[in-house]
């Protein structure tokens, strides 16, 4: 397995799991246990087909940037540690990364580090800070949600307006209606009363189950026309919130589970 004549050194690549928001810099550290006399250090991303795509390299005291200049390698003063950074990370930078060393004279076998996983999440809306800053760009899914909520509100207002107009134009139509059941009786939840809006956010599904209350059954004469106003349902009660176990993916990785330990 080994070529007995060529020196080599174990590599680590840390942290094992790194999460950054899009637009932020993502920095891994590739560490050599020892500095061999001559070596090439490569930074790779693992492709979906498990192939290593070279992002950047360090050779003979100089950095070799890859095609994408966002991928930068910096040698630290101790000579054994290398910062491997993605400048302004994008969502599609999420994936598996590693570093590898080739010892000179050329060796067909690359000495690879453990793998590390990068997760780039969508930028979330932050509360305004004291220093004025341009409003962050709404992500696609968030934008869709805002548009949807706005549309529902506009629809409800139009319905209210229409009902008011109908009541004003046809006052007889509203006279025969009565409501059966007491006010204290809880509203039933029918099978069709729970549309589920799912915002797919990485590995997590945060679900808001909108419980639309059924209107009380009207007891009106057959010939009476009436309008039913359906208000958007309130969010599920605390008892219906996602269980802790369903949100496990949101927990940070254990500090024990990584190829290297971050200094305190």
């Amino acid at each position: 397995l080994d070529s007995p004549d060529r020196p080599w050194s174990p590599l680590t690549f840390s942290p094992a799991q790194l999460t950054v928001q899009e637009g932020e810099n993502a920095t891994f550290t590739c560490s050599l246990a020892d500095i061999p006399d001559s070596f090439v250090l490569n930074w790779y991303r693992l492709s979906p087909r498990n192939q290593t795509d070279k992002l950047a390299a360090f050779q003979e005291d100089r950095i070799e940037p890859g095609r994408d200049r966002r991928f930068r390698v910096t040698r630290l003063p101790n000579g054994r540690d290398f910062h491997m950074s993605i400048v302004a990370a994008r969502l599609n930078d999420s994936g598996i990364y590693l570093c590898g060393a080739i010892y000179l004279p050329p060796n067909t076998q690359i000495n690879e580090s453990p793998r590390a996983e990068l997760s780039v999440t969508e930028r979330t809306l932050e509360p305004p800070t004291q220093s004025p800053s341009p409003p962050p760009r709404l992500s696609g899914q968030l934008q869709g949600l805002v548009i949807g909520v706005t549309s529902v509100l506009v629809g409800v207002l139009l319905l209210l307006l229409l009902t008011w107009v109908l009541a004003a134009v046809f006052p007889r139509a509203t006279r025969g209606a009565c409501v059966c059941g007491s006010e204290d009786e809880p509203l039933k939840e029918g099978p069709d009363a729970a549309p589920v809006f799912t915002l797919d956010y990485g590995e997590l599904d945060f679900q808001w189950r909108e419980k639309t209350p059924e209107p009380p059954a009207p007891c009106a004469p057959e010939q009476t026309e009436y309008a039913t106003i359906v208000f958007p349902g309130r969010p599920a009660s605390p008892g219906r919130r996602a269980s802790a176990s369903s949100l496990q993916g949101a927990q940070p990785p254990s500090p024990e589970d990584g190829p290297g330990l971050w200094p305190l």
Partner: antibody, heavy 115, light 108 residues
Amino acid sequence: EVQLVESGGDLVKPGGSLRLSCLASGFTFSNFHMNWVRQAPGKGLQWVAFVNVGGIRTAYADGVKGRFTISRDDAKNTLYLQMDSLRADDTAVYYCARAFPGDYWGQGTLVTVSS
Amino acid sequence: SYVLSQPPSATVTLRQTARLTCGGDSIGRKSVEWYQQKPGQPPVLIIFGDSSRPSGIPERFSGANSGNTATLTISGALAEDEADYYCQVWDSNTKAWVFGEGTQLTVL
């Protein structure tokens, strides 16, 4: 909780063989380099063997080269040390440990080589 | 083969500073790890990468490495710090992990 549990230690005659196992739990075993380190009674720590992630590269202390073989089975989360042609000076507590950095160690298993 | 030299023993007065050394040829080019071992227990990593502390290790432990000497410093040593201390490096030429002989620290 990270745990490394060694097993397989025993009393064996000189020239005999033993296979030590180290079962890992609480972390992604396949993503770590691993070491076997031993400590003879009343002596210091002595590195024995190393295997990197993927099991592609191995390294051995001079005194055990050709007699000991380190291997790993990532599917079983287990590290192995096959010890052949055992000698009296191989008597020691054998520890398995994560390597670079050596942040977790097992409690050790005692190997006694004696006639 | 690569050799790491540690003094066999060292003594420090309670709450004083102890400096333990580990000598090796161009050790400054290597990543040094320090271990603490108490009787009947496995070693515990206290410094890695020359000067980094794993979580749970008290701040009084610090490390440095340059030239031919690596140093473990215990600032304000406590009775519980009485133990054996080992340094360790990887030597890429011999392709081996190397331990120092260990220093037995006594806290008076």
